[in-house]
Interface confidence: low
Amino acid sequence: NKILVKQSPMLVAYDNAVNLSCKYSYNLFSREFRASLHKGLDSAVEVCVVYGNYSQQLQVYSKTGFNCDGKLGNESVTFYLQNLYVNQTDIYFCKIEVMYPPPYLDNEKSNGTIIHVKGKHLCPSPLFPGPSKP
């Protein structure tokens, strides 16, 4: 038995930030779960993790350098990514694992969301310009 995940097919990050909502066919209330967001067709980069446990506050972290936050709904987790770079335009997949109560459950691989980062290029501040061009 697998959890189904719905994601927007595409999102555009205009200001180097985006909200990606992962909607699950499963109610996360009073569950111990680990929701994660993965970058790339092979899901090789774990962008952000939201760990939930009914007895603890939500834990949100990235071990791969992304600036992320997470919000929990009954059947969804929303990842808020900031300071994205144009070259981080890619496909992003939601993953969910429920550890408690048994049985362990995870999701069918979703179709993913293409995040197109169109924002400012996070250039140096004009007060500190880079080397001048000839």
């Epitope: 680990r34 007895s55 603890q56 506050q57 834990q59 949100v60 972290y61 071990k63 550890m99």
Partner: antibody, heavy 127, light 104 residues
Framework: EVQLVESGGGLVKPGGSLRLSCGGS????????MNWVRQAPGKGLEWVGR??????????DYAAPVKGRFTISRDYSKNTLYLQMNSLKTEDTGVYYC??????????????????WGQGTTVTVSS | EIVLTQSPATLSLSPGERATLSCRAS??????LAWYQQKPGQAPRLLIY???NRATGIPARFSGSGSGTDFTLTISSLEPEDFAVYYC??????FGPGTKVDIK
């Protein structure tokens, strides 16, 4: 991004005291189970002790060689972990690392290795 | 107290070769065993947790196996950056003495 940064190392005489600090950022520090691990020069890794997360009672456990001499504590408001080292011996010399398991899962029953480490701070006990 | 023993103490191999490192526990630790890599002057890095699961960002050439008292870390084809010291660790946090993998 998840980060741990240790400070407070230095040179101390046998019998002296030293307090190490470890600042945590990028994760919910209060709930994390935090550890100290040390490494004597040219030797292997040795676990020193750990302190549980706030929601798990915040109690500490220690390795036999340091029990009664070292105390682990934390300041929740400052996201900081401490290692108070008293009655120091020459064999306490080494690099001290602050580590946590931002576990794949949380809690002792879901231990999954220490996947976040600080850069280490050096303690030298010598007369 | 559970004691971990690692063998061999040193493993001399060439890039491209397969490395097999062993860790034995004095009593069962179920699958609660982790493997770390440490390079000179650096903090250890978690490679494998729960005996066989690769940690985030660890290349597929690293694999772990075993349960109970006998565990193995395998590096399928050594890359130049894999020459380092490898430690195993069990849930009550004690570490093995380490295996140094150096260039033949």
């Amino acid at each position: 991004e998840v980060q741990l940064v240790e400070s407070g190392g230095g040179l101390v005489k046998p019998g002296g005291s030293l307090r190490l600090s470890c600042g945590g950022s990028g994760f919910t520090f209060n709930n994390a189970w935090m550890n100290w691990v040390r490494q004597a020069p040219g030797k292997g890794l040795e676990w020193v002790g750990r302190i549980k997360g706030k929601t798990d009672g915040g109690t500490a456990d220690y390795a036999a060689p340091v029990k009664g001499r070292f105390t682990i504590s934390r300041d929740y408001s400052k996201n900081t972990l401490y290692l108070q080292m008293n009655s120091l011996k020459t064999e306490d010399t080494g690099v001290y690392y602050c580590t946590t398991y931002l576990p794949y899962y949380y809690g002792s029953e879901r231990w999954s290795g220490m996947d976040v480490w600080g850069q280490g701070t050096t303690v030298t006990v010598s007369s | 107290e559970i004691v971990l023993t690692q063998s061999p103490a040193t493993l001399s191999l060439s890039p491209g070769e397969r490395a097999t490192l062993s860790c034995r526990a004095s009593q069962s630790v179920s699958s609660y065993l982790a493997w770390y890599q440490q390079k000179p002057g650096q903090a250890p890095r978690l490679l494998i947790y729960d005996a066989s699961n690769r940690a985030t960002g660890i290349p597929a050439r690293f694999s772990g196996s075993g349960s109970g008292t006998d565990f193995t870390l395998t590096i399928s084809s050594l890359e130049p950056e894999d020459f380092a010291v490898y430690y195993c660790q069990q849930r009550s946090n004690t570490f093995g003495p380490g295996t140094k993998v150096d260039i033949k």
